[in-house]
Amino acid sequence: GPRAPCAAACTCAGDSLDCGGRGLAALPGDLPSWTRSLNLSYNKLSEIDPAGFEDLPNLQEVYLNNNELTAVPSLGAASSHVVSLFLQHNKIRSVEGSQLKAYLSLEVLDLSLNNITEVRNTCFPHGPPIKELNLAGNRIGTLELGAFDGLSRSLLTLRLSKNRITQLPVRAFKLPRLTQLDLNRNRIRLIEGLTFQGLNSLEVLKLQRNNISKLTDGAFWGLSKMHVLHLEYNSLVEVNSGSLYGLTALHQLHLSNNSIARIHRKGWSFCQKLHELVLSFNNLTRLDEESLAELSSLSVLRLSHNSISHIAEGAFKGLRSLRVLDLDHNEISGTIEDTSGAFSGLDSLSKLTLFGNKIKSVAKRAFSGLEGLEHLNLGGNAIRSVQFDAFVKMKNLKELHISSDSFLCDCQLKWLPPWLIGRMLQAFVTATCAHPESLKGQSIFSVPPESFVCDDFLKPQIITQPETTMAMVGKDIRFTCSAASSSSSPMTFAWKKDNEVLTNADMENFVHVHAQDGEVMEYTTILHLRQVTFGHEGRYQCVITNHFGSTYSHKARLTVNVLPSFTKTPHDITIRTTTVARLECAATGHPNPQIAWQKDGGTDFPAARERRMHVMPDDDVFFITDVKIDDAGVYSCTAQNSAGSISANATLTVLETPSLVVPLEDRVVSVGETVALQCKATGNPPPRITWFKGDRPLSLTERHHLTPDNQLLVVQNVVAEDAGRYTCEMSNTLGTERAHSQLSVLPAAGCRKDGTTVG
C-alpha cells in the first residue's frame, strides 16, 4: 500500500524519523511502520509505553538520550529487533537483567551519563548480543566479579570512563572478544596482578586520569594482543619489567603526566615490539646508559617536559629504529654544550626536538651519531654560539629550527650564515646578534663576514685544565681549573663528576687580572675533595660560565687507591723431594693487586724453567710439583698495584734421603801404598758419615785419616791387614744409606813368576 505519512510532531528523512527536541512527555501516537531509525532525544520522556512500539517491524535504532527515564525501557514487540539503543543522559539508577532479556538483537547499548552506582552480575544476562556497551559518566563505584560475563560471547567495546571505580577485582572481566576497554577518569589506585586476565583479544586499554600509583607484577598479564595502553595522568613513580610482563604485542605506551622519576634498565624487556613510548610531563632527571636498550623496535620516544639534565653516553644505545625523539622542555643544556656520544646508537633518527632546554651553545660533537637527521628543532633556546662542525655531518638535514636573539657574533660564528644559506636551511632560523654592541639586533644573515671578528674573548676560555690524578684513600686532593675572559660579566663556577653537577661541592674561587694583558681577567676554581673514598672515583670537569656562555674543561680522572695488604702470607715449609710444595699468598688493595713470585731475588728458577710451577689465581696458592733439592731457597710473594707494592718471604727447605753422588768403587793397592776411599754423599739435612770395616766400626790408627765431614778416608802405608770390605754409612733424619768398597792388598812391588810387575 501507500507509504504512511511522517508522524505529526516529527520530521522524516528516508527511513529515519526525527522527533528530537520537541518537548515530548509521551510517545507520538502515529509512528509509521517503515521507521528504521527513531530519534526521541532531548524530550521530557520519563517512561515509555511499550504499546507505542507494537507496529514497528523495521525499527533498528532508537535514540532516547537526554530524557528523564529512570530505568531501561521496554520497547514492546520492537525490543527483539532493535540493534542500537541510546539511553545516555537520563536518570537511570540501575540496570536489571530482566529489562534487557527481550533485546535479542541489541548490539549497541549506550547508558552513559546516568546515575548507575553499581554493576552486579545480574545486570547483563546472556541473550542480547551486545558488541558495544557504554557506561561512562555514571556513579559506578563497584564492579561485581563476573558482572559482564553474560556478554562474553559478543562484547567488543566497553566504556567505563568517568565513574567512581576505586578497585578492579582480579580477573574482573571474562570477555574474550573485547578489543577496547575504557576506564579513564576513575579512582583506581592499584592494578593487581592478573586483573585483566580473560581479555584475550583486548587491543586498547585506557586507564588515564585515575590515581594509579602502583602496577603490581603481572598487572597486564593475559593481554598478549594489546597494542595500545594509556596510563596518562596517574601517580606512577616507576616502570618496572614485572608490571609490563605479558605485553608482548604492545605498540604504544602512553605514560605522560605521571611522577616517574627513573627508568629502570630492565624495565622494557617484556614489550620489545613497542613502537611509541610517551613519557612526557614526568619527573625524569636523568637517562642512564642503555636504560632503553631493549626497545629495538621503538620508533617514537617522547620525553618532553621532564627535568632531564643528564644524558649518559650510550643512553639511547639499542634504539636503532627510533625515528622521532622529543626532548623539548628539559634541562639538557650540558649535553649539547659539552658531551659527545649522548645520541650514539640512534642510527635511524630523523627528527630531534630540543625546544626550550636552556641551551646556550652547541658543541662540535653534540650531535655525533645523528648523521641521518632530517629535522632538528633548537628553538626556544637562547643560543649564543654554535661551534664549527656542529651540524655539518648531518648530510640529510632539511629543517633546522633556531630562534635566538642572544648570538655572540664573533669570528667563531662566521662559518654559520654561509653554511645555512648553502644548505638552504635559513627558512626556520631566526638568529640575531646580542654582541658585540655594534651588531646588536642584526640578523646573522645581514652581518657582513668581515664584521665577525675576535678582538676580545667574551666567553671564558680555559687556560689551566684539571689534571688526572691518583690518590690514596683518606688523603685530601684538589682539582684546579682556570679560565680567562675579557668580559666583566659575572662568572659562575661549577664542577661536574661523571657529567653530573656536584651540588654541594667544596670549592674555592678567585679572580685576578692577567699579567700579560691588563684587560683580561683570569678566574680560578679549586675543587677540594677531602679524605677521599672509592666513591670519589670518576671524571671531574669544571664548567665556567658568564653571560656569553659556558666553557667546559677536559675531564680529569680521579683514581682512588689503597696500598696492597696481605690477607694470606706464605709460611716457611720443610718437605721431602718428589712431593708437592704449597705456598699461599693473597692481598687486597685498590685496584686489586697483582701477585708475583720470586726465588732468591730472581724470576728464573728451576721449578719455573721445568714447568713444575703452578699458580692458581683463584685459590691464592703457588705449587711446586716433584720438588727437587734445587727448589730450596727463599720465595718472595710481591703484591703490587698502582699505589705501591709489598713483599713477604718464606723459606722452602727440601729434605732428601742420603745418597752417593759418586759411586764407591772396589780398589786394589800394593803394600806400602796410600789409598783414598771417597763417600761423596748428598742429602738434607747433610748426612752423618760413619765408616765400617767388615761389620764393625773402623778402628782408626795413625795411618788412617778422615776429612772433617768423614767423606774421604785416606789409609797410608797400606798393610796386608787393611784388606777387606769397607762400608760407608750415610745417615740423616730421613734414613740411612750404605755403600761398599772391597779393598784388595797385594804384596810389595816385585817380579812375579809370570814376569809381570806387582804394584
Epitope: K364, F388, D389, V392, C411, Q412, K414, W415, P418, W419, I421, G422, R423, P448, P449, E450, C454, F457, Q461, I462
Partner: antibody, heavy 121, light 111 residues
C-alpha cells in the same frame, strides 16, 4: 711580527718516516687554527692537514689519512706533522700556515717559507 | 683533478683588467667564503682576498673578489708586471671535511 719557521724536511726512502716542526712567534699561537699545505714540484697547492686550537680537533686530506698525524704543543708554540709510510708522491715543499681565526674554514693569512721533503730510493 | 676549477692560464697587458674564475659546488663555495692566494715565483703563497671580497692590509685595491652561487672570481685592474704569478682560489669543503684549492692560474703580463 708573525713568523712561521718549518724544519725537519729532508731525503727519506719510501716507507720511511719524517717529523716536521713549525715554530710560531708573533701571535697567540694557542688561539689559532693551524695547517700544513704542500706543493709538489711544478704543481699547485694541496692542503694536507689542520688542527683546532682548543680541543685539538684534527682534519686530514684523504691522500694522507691514516699515514700522517698533526699535533701541536701550545706551551712551545710549535706545530708538528708526523709522516709515516711515505710515498714518492709525498715529495713536496711543506708549508706551515696560520688560520685567520680559530675555525678550520678560515683562510690562511700567514705562511712559512716551507721545508722540502723528498721521498726517493 | 682539483675540487675547485680554475683556468690554467690567463694573460693581459700592463694597465689591462684581468679576471680569473673559480667554480665549485654547494658543499664548498656555495656554503663558504672564498679566499684568493698569490704565489710569486720561488716564494711562499700570500693571502690576497678573503671572505669573498675582503683585502688584507697591504694588498692594493686593484685586486678585488666577488662570488655568486657556487662560483667566485678574482679581478685585477691596472695590470702590472709584478702581478705575474700563480693565483689560487681556496675554501673549505664540507663534504670532504677539508680545505680545498683550485688548480691554480698562471698569470702572464705581456710586454
Amino acid at each position: 711580527e708573525v713568523q712561521l719557521l718549518e724544519s725537519g724536511g729532508g731525503l727519506v726512502q719510501p716507507g720511511g718516516s719524517l717529523r716536521l716542526s713549525c715554530a710560531a712567534s708573533g701571535f697567540t699561537f694557542s688561539n689559532y687554527y693551524m695547517s700544513w699545505v704542500r706543493q709538489a714540484p711544478g704543481k699547485g697547492l694541496e692542503w694536507v692537514s689542520g688542527i683546532s686550537p682548543g680541543d685539538s680537533s684534527t682534519y686530514y686530506a684523504d691522500s694522507v689519512k691514516g699515514r700522517f698525524t698533526i699535533s701541536r704543543d701550545n706551551s712551545k708554540n710549535t706545530l708538528y706533522l708526523q709522516m709515516n709510510s711515505l710515498r714518492a708522491e709525498d715529495t713536496a715543499v711543506y708549508y706551515c700556515a696560520k688560520g685567520l681565526y680559530s675555525n678550520p674554514n678560515e683562510p690562511f693569512d700567514y705562511w712559512g717559507q716551507g721545508t722540502l721533503v723528498t721521498v726517493s730510493s | 683533478q682539483s675540487v675547485l676549477t680554475q683556468p690554467p692560464s690567463a694573460s693581459g697587458t700592463p694597465g689591462q683588467r684581468v679576471t680569473i674564475s673559480c667554480t665549485g659546488s654547494s658543499s664548498n663555495i656555495g656554503s663558504n667564503y672564498v679566499s684568493w692566494y698569490q704565489q710569486l715565483p720561488g716564494t711562499a703563497p700570500k693571502l690576497l682576498i678573503y671572505d669573498d671580497s675582503q683585502r688584507p692590509s697591504g694588498v692594493p685595491d686593484r685586486f678585488s673578489g666577488s662570488k655568486s652561487g657556487t662560483s667566485a672570481s678574482l679581478a685585477i685592474s691596472g695590470l702590472r708586471s709584478e702581478d705575474e704569478a700563480d693565483y689560487y682560489c681556496g675554501t673549505w669543503d664540507y663534504s670532504l671535511n677539508g680545505y680545498v684549492f683550485g688548480g691554480g692560474t698562471k698569470l702572464t703580463v705581456l710586454r
